[in-house]
Interface confidence: low
Amino acid sequence: SGTTNTVAAYNLTWKSTNFKTILEWEPKPVNQVYTVQISTKSGDWKSKCFYTTDTECDLTDEIVKDVKQTYLARVFSYPAGNVESTGSAGEPLYENSPEFTPYLETNLGQPTIQSFEQVGTKVNVTVEDERTLVRRNNTFLSLRDVFGKDLIYTLYYWKSSSSGKKTAKTNTNEFLIDVDKGENYCFSVQAVIPSRTVNRKSTDSPVECMGQEKGEFREI
């Protein structure tokens, strides 16, 4: 139903990494425009991306207000140049998104190894604590601030001269591992939220290897 020259949006999909959250949909508009609304289950609808010809809408500012809430979005279709026109039921056509709970579902972004330092047979590897767009008291929280000890990192490390990998885990952003003296090692880390059932792991960080000078990064 609806006016003959508008079609309802479809394939509404949440794309979210480290809480940067964009709703995408189809189709590319032909003689129509879209407006998006977002709401928590118990809250009021808030309109975003008014009368846009895009097929995506950045909803980050809304979801970061409370990342543990469950959100629902809907995309309205209007005839281009006649946004007052409605469907046969007296309302514009719209389609609902799947529910989205940022804390549970946002993808973990690719982590970065910030530094490593060798002292004797120990190496301290530090993972960069990435900043998110979640705010508290006007400051942006880091991934660790938001997830606390729900977030762990897994370190994969191996001698540059071999392919046998070892692993270590931490619920902070630092690893202290034993290494063989005189050997160079390569490192990669992965962010993990073990308690999740979906989107549990990030992609692996870029590989960093120990060079001739202590703490030098060499990406391979």
Epitope: Y103, K149, D150, I193, R196, T197
Partner: antibody, heavy 126, light 107 residues
């Protein structure tokens, strides 16, 4: 009807072991966290820990870590709280409760309780 | 651990009164606070979650408000069955913690 039914009262001696149970019915047992709460005589509520029966993910309060074991058997929709060696100070009422899947819930960090068992009184005395 | 402090520890009121119980968190907990009612020799009953959302089946005379560190439970018109002990609980961070309880007695 959604309910949690706990096993009956227990009287034990110090050093003995014990396993009490909490059986869920009327809902998908594997999809909700179950928690255990202690209430010592005349005192308030203390959160002991929780378990997600779907994958047996378990979290303990630091005060109870190593003192008790929380487990579940999803085939019979039952959660358990057990002690390997009881002490007189374990004398208390123990409640199981289901975590509400409302605002603030995520499987990463669960929320408030909604459904409570009737409680199991455990008395430890020589 | 986050400490939850309820006040008053006890209070006396009459049927029909409007009663307010407060709960203060030692650090900010957003809206992640629940309220429970417990009568003598009975299991607790869930009243409110997410600071202000009523659990299913709870009478509308119960309401909750607050965010951050300060929260209130209000009973707009006390009924005889409301005399009990009330507990707040934060679930913002691990470990979950309860307030010490507020005993509501008949005046």
């Amino acid at each position: 009807e959604v309910q949690l039914v706990q096993s009956g009262a227990e009287v034990k001696k110090p050093g003995e072991s014990l396993k009490i149970s909490c059986k869920g019915s009327g809902y998908s047992f594997t999809s909700y966290w179950i928690g255990w709460v202690r209430q010592m005589p005349g005192k308030g509520l203390e959160w002991m820990g929780i378990i997600y029966p779907g994958d047996s993910d378990t979290r303990y309060s630091p005060s109870f870590q190593g003192q008790v074991t929380i487990s579940a058997d999803k085939s019979i929709s039952t959660a358990y709280l057990q002690w390997s060696s009881l002490k007189a100070s374990d004398t208390a009422m123990y409640y199981c409760a289901r975590i509400h899947r409302g605002a603030g819930y995520s499987s990463s960090w669960p929320g408030a309780f909604d459904i409570w068992g009737q409680g199991t009184m455990v008395t430890v005395s020589s | 651990d986050i400490q939850m402090t309820q006040s008053p520890s006890s209070l006396s009121a009459s049927v029909g009164d409007r009663v307010t119980i407060t709960c203060r968190a030692s650090q900010g907990i957003s809206r992640w606070l629940a309220w429970y009612q417990q009568k003598p020799e009975k299991a607790p009953k869930s009243l409110i979650y997410a600071a202000s959302s009523l659990q299913s089946g709870v009478p509308s005379r119960f309401s909750g408000s607050g965010s951050g560190t300060d929260f209130t439970l209000t009973i707009s018109s006390l009924q005889p069955e409301d005399f009990a002990t009330y507990y707040c609980q934060q679930y913002d961070s691990d470990p979950i913690t309860f307030g010490q309880g507020t005993r509501l007695e008949i005046k």
